[in-house]
Every structure is written in C-alpha cells, then in structure tokens.
Interface confidence: medium
Amino acid sequence: EVEKTACPSGKKAREIDESLIFYKKWELEACVDAALLATQMDRVNAIPFTYEQLDVLKHKLDELYPQGYPESVIQHLGYLFLKMSPEDIRKWNVTSLETLKALLEVNKGHEMSPQVATLIDRFVKGRGQLDKDTLDTLTAFYPGYLCSLSPEELSSVPPSSIWAVRPQDLDTCDPRQLDVLYPKARLAFQNMNGSEYFVKIQSFLGGAPTEDLKALSQQNVSMDLATFMKLRTDAVLPLTVAEVQKLLGPHVEGLKAEERHRPVRDWILRQRQDDLDTLGLGLQGGIPNGYLVLDLSMQEALS
C-alpha cells in the first residue's frame, strides 16, 4: 500500500504523459487522478513506466473500480495487464474480441499464464460458446489451446468453428477430446468431395469409430502411417487386413516399422497369419492357421 500524502504544489497531473516517469511512487499516488488515468489508459503503454510505478497505477484503478474494471479500461491496459492477478480478472466482463486480442498481444511469445487462462475463460463464458472468430484468435496465439480444454468445454464448440482448426492445433489432444471433436468435424466438412474431405478430417480421425474407418477404406484415401498410429485401438482392431491395405494404400509398407507399437501390434494379434502374409511385409504374430477365433466382445455383450 502507498501512503496517502498531499500532492506537492504544481505537480498535479493534467494528463498522462512522459513527465510522469520522473514521479516517485508517492507522487504518482498523490498527483494522478484515477478517473484521468482511466480515460487516458491508452497513453500508459507508450510511456516507459517502471514495474513499481505500474503497481501504483494499478492500485489507483483498483480503488476506482473495486467491482472490476470496465471494458473501456481493460482494452487499453497494455503492459499493465501483466500486473493483474487471476482474482482481478475474474471480476471483469470482457465481451469484445478486440479487447481479447489486445491483451493476448501483450503476452505474445510467452506460455499461457494463469492470467491469460482466466481471461480466456471469462471471455468464452461471456460469449456462451467458442465461436469461430474466438477460436481463430486463440489458436493463432496458442496453437495448443484447443487441447487444453476438457471434453465438456469442447462440447460447446459449434461445428462451424471447426473450420478454424489447423492440424497442429490438435497435436496434443487425447482420444477423449477427439471423441468430441470428430463428430463436429464430420458435420462441418460433410459437403466436401472425397479427397478434400479426407484432407480436412484427417487430423480428427483419432475420434473415429470402426465403421467410419471401413467407409474411408473404400475411398482410396491413402492414409499415412502417422495418422494411422493415432487412431483409437478399439476402432482399428475390427478392421480386416484387406481394409487396412485399402485404407493405407501405398503407405501399407510402413506397418512393418510399427509392428511393435500400438495400435499395429494389437491389430496384428487379431489377424490370421495367412491374411497378414498376403501383404508380403513379413508381419509376424497373427493367429496361426487352423485356430478358432472367438469374438470375446460379442460374447460379453450377450452375457
């Protein structure tokens, strides 16, 4: 807390300008009117205040707006945003995408801080859903943003927003997140033709069920091994050797290099060795000829 002291004669600030950088902390407290500061916040960013001086300016705004800053002030916080705590930010009502962009710009190049996470949370809650423009903005600043959301939060993403998602935005998503995103992507891209559709849906396929993989295998998509390795194991297991061959096309040769890794390893164990041999890749570990294959999942469903 800064002690309340009278402003020295002639030092009362008439506007927010560079002369204030020479003010001591107590002089800033005594001589800068909080209402003046609020109306000229856009100037603060252009003045090289020290962090200590910024603390004083923040304190003045906190006193003026104990219930939280208005958006007209928030939009022009600039580097003062770095002084805010998540508790401060929880009091805000941020509705303008321009405000969000301005504050994200301040934090650009840094990891997502608790302040930024709180800001985004407040913004998205205020909007009611994660619309395309917001998603565009957030993934531009934080490519991993989408995968930081819970499946519950992702459920509020409208299918139209999926157009804003780039493959790298999904790099760190787990199967539960793709579970929610895949059907939205399918809905968003369904009017595209076969090859264009596959290019768009490819990064979401970690949420695809077996039936969709079977359908894709009929469409000459030539899925690469990196995508195949990200598919859900339970979705891959029921695929036949012929279906996997059609799904991968020329990339089928890559199975050999991945034969010890999931889902390839588990898939091999479910295939007849004779069928695997037709691929000519030397894949080993299939069911020997003459053995009976029991579908245990069907048995469990019936019991």
Epitope: P151, D179, L187, Q190, G207, P209
Partner: nanobody
Framework: QLQLQESGPGLVKPSETLSLTCTVS?????????WGWIRQPPGKGLEWIGS???????YYNPSLKSRVTISVDTSKNQFSLKLSSVTAADTAVYYC??????????????WGQGTLVTVSS
C-alpha cells in the same frame, strides 16, 4: 431420417428428480455418434446439459455434473436424462439431440421438438 421425441412429466416438485426419455425412430440408435440433452430456460439462451458418445464416454456440463446422468438403451431405441435435486432454475424446455451417420458419408444433427418441464410445488 432420424426422428427424436422427448417424453416425461411436465411438472416436477423441487428437490425431486427430473426424468426424461428420448425415443428415436426412423433409424437405429446404435448408428449415432452421440446422444445429448440441451435445455432453454424461459427468456434465456440454450444450455448444453451433456452427451454420451459412440465410444461410451459421457460428458456433462461442469455446472450440472453432480446432478446429471445420461444413459442409452439400444434395445428400446431410447436414451434418457435424469437431473436430481431440481429447483425452479431448472424450469426449461428440454431438447434431446443426436448425430447420425456412423459409417455413412453424410451426417446430420437431429433435435426433438422439445418438452417444457416446470419445477414447482
């Protein structure tokens, strides 16, 4: 073309459990990607309640999570919603929703026509 129809009591007493069923016709419920519930309180926007996915995973709105259960009965071509400890704030039009098309090349999101549930003693 899937058709969805909500059914259940239109009036529920405070602190009781709201139970709604959604009956699916025009196709098999097991060919859907997900089944979900959404509500709209009078004069307010839509609020997602929760969804159950093809994989069996269930996701609920965090603000309702402790009170919600969604389940699917494929043998009856139905899915249901249970919301416990209701208050007047749970008064809303409740919609069931589903997305069809597992294994198909086109897909669509279907909604029921909605049913008004009033919580009052």
């Amino acid at each position: 073309q899937l058709q969805l129809q909500e059914s259940g009591p239109g009036l529920v007493k405070p602190s009781e459990t709201l139970s709604l069923t959604c009956t699916v016709s025009g196709g098999s419920i097991s060919s859907s990607y997900y089944w979900g519930w959404i509500r709209q309180p009078p004069g307010k926007g839509l609020e997602w309640i929760g969804s159950i996915y093809h994989s069996g995973n269930t996701y609920y709105n965090p603000s309702l999570k402790s009170r919600v259960t969604i389940s699917v009965d494929t043998s009856k071509n139905q899915f249901s919603l249970k919301l416990s400890s209701v208050t007047a704030a749970d008064t809303a039009v409740y919609y069931c929703t589903s997305q069809d098309g597992v294994g198909a090349t086109t897909t669509e999101e279907y909604w029921g026509q909605g049913t008004l549930v009033t919580v009052s003693s």
